[in-house]
């Protein structure tokens, strides 16, 4: 118990003056407070909590549900405090079957003992299944038993509390651990497409898909060199355990030319952020260009074989294109093919292969390419020696 | 790290009494779980007692309870045990162990990190 020491406030003192009391149940709890300026005692065990305002507690028939801390508090602020364990053979364990665990971090089994004379109080699984080797525990009878460290793959680990009596192991109600995976990586971030070029009232729409071990990454779209907030919306799964995935998905509904610029979308948990862009371009309207790979005027001998080739850009894409030697079509010696699969493509070449030459073929070949907004030609100018 | 010392072995009589100890030094004050393993000749280190440091849970196997008590004193950073009715067959070497924490299988001597040297205790008959 404490000692006083004159002029300045002290705890207040407790009866009976032990830091525990064993009691059995049915029993009385008689606990006395004295204080000149007692406040309340409070009861607390597990996550309940229960005051009294007279200084002397008295429970006439203890139950095992009685076990816990009693605190008694003076004016001051001061408290001191006596923990009672109501002996029920019936009822071994005070049980919260709430358990969740951070990965790497302690979590405490909350299975306090209402007997702490028991012995070997400990874990057990479920249904005689082992516990996994490397499983630590520090156990205490008013708390309950701290697993130590909480490893991944602990997570849906069925667990008892455990002890020995009278030489036969009791178990108390099942626990299922639930572990929140730690961040040991930043997020994995990916983007539907790399760019994208529209035409002004076309829709935009890009997907992010982050992935990480919890749904509590944080991810949004922003704008480069704007605060802006953008209109985003998310679907996400959880494929199986610690494998999250969400997709945020941007849409603008009808692009601007204003609206072109960088897109990105950014990701971060504690352990580190991650981001990938996206390039929108808009143009007022689509456009044709086209790049000569050879020379427009061209030199040939007679009987010798000549390629005009062309590249172009095309935006959207190219639906009629045709070569012509006066005024009549090709209809073979030519082939057009887009200059790389990438769906985002817009450069294509177009070859008009020339054979054997005669002098008479001289003249202008021309390329002609039409989409749905514009034309475009290009001429060459062929001399036969 | 932690030093573990035992003493209060030696030679009894069967039916007689004897009490170890085991004094804890270094970075004790992280090892919350203290244990008595034994082993005798020619046989698989067994387990004998273990308490827990700040909570005060003591575990035994069913063989040795009653016969045996663990007990603490952290004033002292010393553990005890005291042996009863002793017999024949608990002549062996006992050793103390501890770690920070209990594994899920306590009586598993593989799974404590820190070991005594070992004290003989031997029962006459």
């Known amino acids: 118990q404490p000692s006083v020491s004159p002029g300045e406030p002290s705890p207040p003192s407790i009866h009976p003056g032990k830091s525990d009391l064993i009691v059995r149940v049915g029993d009385e709890i008689r606990l006395l407070c004295t204080d000149p300026g007692f406040v309340k005692w409070t009861f607390e065990i597990l996550d309940e909590t229960n005051e009294n305002k007279q200084n002397e507690w008295i429970t006439e028939k203890a139950e095992a549900t009685n076990t816990g801390k009693y605190t008694c508090t003076n004016k001051h602020g001061l408290s001191n405090s006596i923990y009672v364990f109501v002996r029920d053979p019936a009822k071994l364990f005070l049980v919260d079957r709430s358990l969740y665990g951070k990965e790497d971090n302690d979590t405490l089994v909350r299975c306090p003992l209402t007997d702490p004379e028991v012995t070997n109080y400990s874990l057990k699984g479920c249904q005689g299944k082992p516990l996994p080797k490397d499983l630590r525990f520090i156990p205490d009878p008013k708390a309950g038993i701290m697993i130590k460290s909480v490893k991944r793959a602990y997570h849906r680990l069925c667990l008892h509390c455990s002890v020995d009596q009278e030489g036969k192991s009791v178990l108390s109600e099942k626990f299922i651990l639930k572990v929140r995976p730690a961040f040991k990586a930043v997020p994995v971030v990916s983007v539907s497409k790399a760019s994208y070029l529209l035409r002004e009232g076309e829709e935009f729409t890009v997907t992010c898909t982050i992935k990480d071990v919890s749904s509590s990454v944080y991810s949004t779209w922003k704008r480069e060199n704007s605060q802006t907030k953008l209109q985003e919306k998310y679907n996400s799964w959880h494929h199986g355990d610690f494998n999250y995935e969400r997709q945020a998905t941007l849409t603008i509904s009808s692009a601007r030319v204003n609206d072109s610029g960088v897109f990105m979308c950014y990701a971060n948990n504690t352990f580190g952020s991650a981001n990938v862009t996206t390039t929108l371009e808009v143009v007022d309207k689509g456009f044709i260009n086209i790049f000569p790979m050879i020379n427009t005027t061209v030199f040939v001998n007679d009987g010798e074989n000549v390629d005009l080739i062309v590249e172009y850009e095309a935006f959207p894409k190219p639906e009629h294109q045709q070569w012509i030697y006066m005024n009549r079509t090709f209809t073979d010696k030519w082939e057009d093919y887009p200059k790389s699969e990438n769906e985002s493509n817009i450069r294509y070449v177009s070859e008009l292969h020339l054979t054997r030459l005669k002098g008479t073929e001289g003249g202008t070949y021309t390329f002609l390419v039409s989409n749905s907004d514009v034309n475009a030609a290009i001429a060459f100018n062929v001399y036969v020696n | 790290e932690v030093q573990l010392v035992e003493s209060g072995g030696g030679l009894v009589r069967a039916g007689g009494s004897l009490r170890l100890s085991c004094a804890a030094s270094g970075r004790t004050f992280t090892y919350d779980a203290r244990a008595w393993f034994r082993q005798a000749p020619g046989k698989e280190r067994e387990f004998v007692a273990a308490?827990?440091?700040?909570?005060?849970?003591?575990y035994y196997p069913n063989s040795m309870k009653g016969r045996f008590t663990i007990s603490r004193d952290n004033a002292k950073n010393t553990v005890y045990l005291q042996m009863n009715s002793l017999k024949p067959e608990d002549t062996a070497v006992y050793y103390c162990?501890?770690?920070?924490?209990?594994?899920?299988?306590?009586?598993?001597?593989?799974?404590?990190?820190?070991w005594g040297q070992g004290t003989l205790v031997t029962v006459s008959s």
């Open positions: 308490i827990s440091w700040s909570g005060g849970s003591t």
């Open positions: 162990a501890a770690d920070e924490s209990f594994p899920a299988y306590y009586s598993d001597y593989a799974l404590y990190r820190y």
